[in-house]
């Protein structure tokens, strides 16, 4: 109707990076920008994704290099993390959130795709990492190896080999395992502290240089106490699981101290593995019973999990795997390992700013049934799996509903702010829920809408619209972009209007009647009044229309509802040649060129497009006859 299609500003970017996947208009003290997500952008050797700031009138885009942001104390994997897959602007302070839902970190032998977001302040400076689903690894362990280096240990090289082999099994790195080694005989010395080395390679290198210090006495109690009171303190981390591995070849010369030493270790929650090396006993034909009892006493209970004995130093290599496996069986403690909580949550797949924080969709949470998490300045709210059961029953738990594929919120005069989330795969047809979140990790689900058609992806896009700008939501639009009709993926947008406290179905928006795939409803944007009639409007993207060139549809708001017939359809081919997937993202909240009219930003594959609004001239015709 009044969007200019003759002089769009087409901002080019990388197609391979999918520059344009998300777009947001941005205002910094009067200067207008587009923030553009490029979730496949490369940073160095990694395809991290990134976000660009683009001036709206002329000039080139600048990469914000958010892909370089690193989290300390985790072993991160940023490759393919899809930074920029979701963007959410906070109009209050003009900060925005850029999410990397496939950001993952190493935990033992697994990579956990918890996702994370970067908060960027109004002047495009990174300010904070938001990662509510990030949990400590079960391999967050401080391991101190207590090595008997007394004279009777022979040959030392076998002990060294054992040490190196066991270290190679450890997942050493930030947020995972730290290893320290002490050696004892008559005295105890730190060979290296817990925080001296940060990789397996470095620890192994250090261990290969440990020499036998000797000693006529074997003061095992002293060695254990030294490890407990000193080694775990120097470089030890708060909250890390404390593990001690004691390797000795004979009865201790200070065994009367063991009772108190072990009591103190228990008090400090040190899990003790103890290895009895029987070489000295076997070489001399001595009965090792007393020695074995002592080592069992040192080992944590139960002995069958924590106690090992080997015939001689050379046989140490035979227990490397078993010892490693026992230590890492601590990973699964009290967990049903066939089930995922937040480990694969992909938090930030969608995002939405609310008054007190940000809502983040986590499609992979709870075995891909999904969840919505909330991060506030006061902390985070992570609803329990059980809180969704009312609408996501147990019997469908293996279906992967993908709740959190999109998140938004509505405001009703009675209930205030209510959150909305889509689960496009729920029971194959899709579902949308309206809910409030509580600090005790429960939810109150107020309403649910279900999709009609299997595979339609109902709920993959949701937008709330305040038509008259009174602060109360009038219309909720739900996209089902894969809706199949007349032999094609046509797409459908469902309209729900607020009546008292419920949203009531009120038909669908009309698209154009073409015989190709369209995916109408892939993106739905509530935009400020485009046609100057004082009602806010809606723009819907159909990025597969016109043989994947894409198109957008403009629907006008009117008296608390939305007119279901589009007032303007803009195809990519009208604007520029070579545009593809035009309409994959849309944002229209700002006047970008200072003409007093709201302008549109539309994403495409490798491009961001700005469409300028034109003024609407109201002509009131009146006939005047003379003589009357």
């Amino acid at each position: 109707f009044n969007m200019d299609t003759r002089k769009p500003r087409v901002i080019p970017g990388s197609r391979t990076a999918f520059f344009g996947y998300t777009v947001q208009q941005h205002d910094i003290s009067g200067n207008k920008w587009l923030v553009v997500g490029a979730p496949l952008e490369t940073n160095g050797y990694q395809k991290t994704g990134d976000v660009y700031k683009c001036p709206v009138i002329h000039g080139n885009c600048t990469k914000l290099n958010l892909g370089r942001v690193t989290l300390s104390n985790v072993s991160e994997r940023k490759d393919n993390m899809r930074l920029g897959l979701s963007l959410a602007t906070n109009p209050k302070d003009n900060s925005f959130l850029a999410c990397s839902p496939l950001w993952s970190h190493e935990c033992g032998s697994s990579y956990y795709t918890t996702g994370m977001c970067s908060r960027v302040n109004s002047n495009f400076r990174f300010s904070k990492t938001v990662a509510p689903a990030l949990q400590r690894c079960q391999t967050y362990m401080d391991i101190v190896i207590v090595l008997d280096g007394s004279n009777s240990i022979y040959p030392w090289v076998e002990v060294q080999h054992f040490l190196i082999n066991i270290l190679k099994k450890f997942y050493i790195g930030p947020g995972q395992i730290q290893v320290g080694v002490v050696q004892y005989g008559e005295d105890v010395v730190h060979e290296f502290h817990l925080n001296d080395y940060r990789s397996v390679k470095d620890v192994v290198e250090a261990a290969s240089h440990i020499e036998q210090r000797g000693g006529t006495e074997t003061r095992t109690a002293f060695g254990i106490e030294f490890a407990r009171s000193e080694a775990f303190q120097k470089g030890g981390r708060k909250g890390a699981k404390k593990v001690m591995i004691v390797i000795t070849d004979g009865e201790s010369h200070d065994s009367p101290d063991l009772e108190k030493v072990i009591q103190q270790s228990e008090r400090d929650n040190v899990t003790r593995y103890a290895v009895a090396v029987l070489g000295y006993y076997n070489r001399r034909g001595i009965n090792p019973e007393t020695f074995l009892n002592e080592i069992k006493y040192i080992a944590s209970d139960p002995d069958d999990k924590h106690f090992f004995n080997v015939t001689d130093e050379a046989a140490l290599k035979d227990i490397v795997d078993a010892l490693g496996d026992r230590i890492f069986s601590l990973e699964g403690t009290n967990k049903n390992e066939t089930s995922f909580g937040l480990e694969m949550s992909q938090t930030g797949f969608s995002s939405h700013v609310v008054e007190d924080g940000v809502l983040l969709g986590a499609v992979g949470a709870y075995d891909w049934n999904g969840a919505v998490l909330k991060e506030t300045s006061a902390g985070k709210v992570i609803p329990l799996r059980e809180s969704y059961l009312k609408e996501f029953p147990e019997e469908l738990k293996n279906h992967g509903a993908y709740l959190g594929y999109t998140v938004t919120s509505v405001v009703s005069s009675r209930q205030g702010r209510v959150y909305v989330a889509g689960a496009p795969r729920f029971n194959h047809t899709g579902k949308v829920i309206l809910f409030t979140m509580h600090n005790n990790r429960s939810l109150t689900i107020h309403q649910a809408m279900r999709g009609q058609q299997i595979g339609s992806y109902f709920g993959s896009e949701i937008t709330s619209v305040d038509i008259d700008g009174d602060g109360v939501t009038d219309v909720l639009l739900v996209g089902a972009p894969m809706y199949f009709n007349e032999g094609r993926e046509r797409g459908k947008v469902y309209v729900y209007e607020l009546r008292q406290n419920l949203f009531v179905y009120n038909g669908t928006l009309k698209d154009s009647h073409s015989y190709q795939n369209a995916r109408f409803g892939s993106s739905i944007a509530s935009v400020r009044d485009l046609n100057q009639d004082s009602y806010n409007d809606v723009v819907v993207g159909a990025p597969l229309e016109d043989n994947h060139a894409g198109a957008i549809y403009i629907f006008h708001g009117f008296r608390g509802s939305i007119l279901k017939t589009p007032k303007q359809r803009i195809t990519a081919s009208e604007l520029a040649t070579g545009l593809q997937y035009f309409g994959c993202s849309i944002h229209g909240q700002l006047d970008l060129n200072e003409d007093g009219l709201i302008d549109l930003a539309v994403g495409a594959l490798g491009n961001a497009v700005i469409l300028w609004s034109r003024p609407v001239v109201q002509i009131n015709a009146s006939l005047h006859f003379e003589p009357s």
């Epitope: 008559e186 006495e217 003061r219 109690a221 002293f222 106490e225 009865e251 201790s252 010369h253 200070d254 065994s255 009367p256 101290d257 063991l258 009772e259 108190k260 072990i262 007393t290 009892n293 002592e294 006493y297």
Partner: antibody, heavy 120, light 109 residues
């Protein structure tokens, strides 16, 4: 030659204090444990307290807990038994003895004993 | 705490007799049991350690054995210098708490 020599015994009034010493020679106190054992007139042996000179861990018999304190000074190769709030039933000959790994945790060397008499 | 019950409390025997003294532990203990000999006015002397090992310098007529929670000191042929009081002693494992038996006085018949 291994030797343990006790000193510090004597007559003390009930409620009084005494400090016994056990001077060790011929071995290093640091690698052993010292026990104090007492024997009341005409009675059997009663274990009193022990110390690991190396770690300073201590153990006490219930009858003396809170009143007696065992300590060691490895630089002087001497162990001590500080006895406070003495009672008539603490009257005994007090022996110190060595306890270590090489005697399989038996008391292999004993001092000659020092007599403590608690009487008004 | 483990109690060591020693029996008999006294016995009369002649030179050349075989003498047996028993200590019973109140609960299962390690083999860290020792036997001492004490003569009037003297400090005790170690005879047996680890239940059955003869301490150096101790005549071989002295021996020790264990059966479950029962520990036995045997003097195979009593000599005049053996008339004394004998004590068993148990060491609590992994601590330096020790317990003595009540003693057995061996007198000349």
């Amino acid at each position: 030659e291994v030797q343990l020599v006790e000193s510090g015994g004597g007559l003390v009034q009930p409620g009084g204090s005494l400090r016994l010493s056990c001077a060790a020679s011929g071995f290093n106190l640091d690698s052993s444990y010292i026990h104090w054992v007492r024997q009341a007139p005409g009675k059997g042996l009663e274990w009193v307290a022990s110390i690991s000179s190396h770690s300073s861990y201590t153990y006490y018999a219930d009858s003396v807990k809170g009143r007696f304190t065992i300590s060691a000074d490895t630089s002087k190769n001497t162990a001590y038994l500080q006895m406070n709030s003495l009672r008539a039933e603490d009257t005994a000959v007090y022996y110190c003895a060595r306890y270590w790994y090489y005697s399989a945790w038996a008391l292999d060397y004993w001092g000659q004993g020092t007599l403590v008499t608690v009487s008004s | 705490d483990i109690q060591m019950t020693q029996s008999p409390s006294s016995l009369s025997a002649s030179v050349g007799d075989r003498v047996t003294i028993t200590c019973r532990a109140s609960q299962s203990v390690s083999s860290a049991v020792a036997w001492y000999q004490q003569k009037p006015g003297k400090a005790p002397k170690l005879l047996i350690y680890s239940a059955s090992s003869l301490y150096s310098g101790v005549p071989s007529r002295f021996s020790g054995s264990r059966s479950g929670t029962d520990f036995t000191l045997t003097i195979s042929s009593l000599q005049p210098e053996d008339f004394a009081t004998y004590y068993c002693q148990q060491s609590a494992p992994y601590s330096s708490l020790i317990t003595f038996g009540q003693g057995t006085k061996v007198e000349i018949k």
